[in-house]
Amino acid sequence: ATKLTEEKYELKEGQTLDVKCDYTLEKFASSQKAWQIIRDGEMPKTLACTERPSKNSHPVQVGRIILEDYHDHGLLRVRMVNLQVEDSGLYQCVIYQPPKEPHMLFDRIRLVVTKGFSGTPGSNENSTQNVYKIPPTTTKALCPLYTSPRTVTQAPPKSTADVSTPDSEINLTNVTDIIRVPVFN
């Protein structure tokens, strides 16, 4: 049984979400990793992914999303810059391990973006400056498409920070939809 947990991040429009996904095991260091959004009753949609194999400290950018994999720490750093209200939602990191299902990394991120002056932090504990400098060299990676059978996962409850759902077997869905966003110049 897997206990699904999530953390809530409340930020203002224009700010940057800066989170880390802990993949723990060294064997996953070079595995391709992805950042997904989970919409109620739908399969997770992949927004961005690292290269395959995933390179150490090598930024990958898809639109406003930047992924950096730090093998020395077992962490995937995810940044979403210039946040918009419509970015609000539930996100997760996964590790691609074909032909098996993607391996989910805890915790899921419940992002709430509100309108307002972006210079005012949404929270003094979990927000970052709204000005963000894009890394000079970034790569756009192609995310894989899976074609094996899939099931729609039940969307977890909309909840506050650090709330756990009851222990239950989860069926991680395969990825079919890739959201493409223009890459910054």
């Epitope: 206990k3 800066d18 802990d22 095991l25 020395d72 077992g74 391996h103 003094n124 504990e125 970052t128």
Partner: antibody, heavy 117, light 111 residues
């Protein structure tokens, strides 16, 4: 080479405050988590809390929540532990650590905090 | 919070012998297919050193004689053949739930 160096340990009176520093070299603290752990003389290890220096998000052990504050300055590649309302039972060697394997690794040498009147 | 109980409190062995240290958690520390149970070694006057992470994976630069096993609530650290430098205090620690917690330690001493 990865290195963490703690400083700021001192003798302080009960009720007093102290700020410890953890200077990192060989890696960027913004790309990892920094944890603080302490060890009272002759006792075991106790996790205090951690920070994601890039996002500023913190987690604490209930025992120190409200009295201790972890912060970080990524431009200085340094993390901090602000300790207020100190008690004699806070006497310990304080370690900062990096993160690896889902837990704490890359330990500093520790700095001694003595709370006594 | 999750309570970790280590046994024995003290283990007296000779170099070359096999050491088996146990750690029991008050609730499961396994999630997402991973057991978040780690082992540290600490010698007097030194900082702890990560030996085993995620129950069974060796930390960087750790000799092959150190191995870990277990899942759920019961875990074991095994040192296949003790070297003189292995005599120290060993702590188990869980990183499954905040607050992270440590066991009380097992002192491995020379017989």
């Amino acid at each position: 080479e990865v290195q963490l160096v703690e400083s700021g340990g001192a003798l302080v009176k009960p009720g007093g405050s102290l700020r410890l520093s953890c200077a990192a070299s060989g890696f960027n603290i913004g790309n990892t988590y920094i944890h603080w752990v302490r060890q009272a003389p002759g006792k075991g290890l106790e996790w205090i809390g951690r920070i994601d220096p890039a996002g500023g998000r913190t987690k604490y052990a209930p025992k120190v929540q409200g009295r201790f504050t972890i912060s970080a300055d990524t431009s200085k590649n340094t993390a901090y532990l602000q300790m207020n309302s100190l008690k004699t039972e806070d006497t310990a060697v304080y370690y900062c650590t990096g993160h690896y394997g889902g837990t704490m690794d890359y330990w500093g040498q520790g700095t001694l905090v003595t709370v006594s009147s | 919070e999750i309570v970790l109980t280590q046994s024995p409190a003290t283990l007296s062995l000779s170099p070359g012998e096999r050491a088996t240290l146990s750690c029991r958690a008050s609730q499961s520390v396994s999630n997402y297919g991973i057991s978040f149970l780690n082992w540290y070694q600490q010698k007097p006057g030194q900082a702890p050193r990560l030996l085993i992470y995620a129950a069974e994976y060796q930390g960087r630069g750790i000799p092959a004689r150190f191995s870990g096993s277990g899942s759920g609530t019961d875990f074991t650290l095994t040192i296949s053949s003790l070297e003189p430098e292995d005599f120290a205090v060993y702590y188990c620690q869980q990183s499954s739930n905040v607050p992270y917690t440590f066991g009380q330690g097992t002192k491995l001493e020379i017989k």
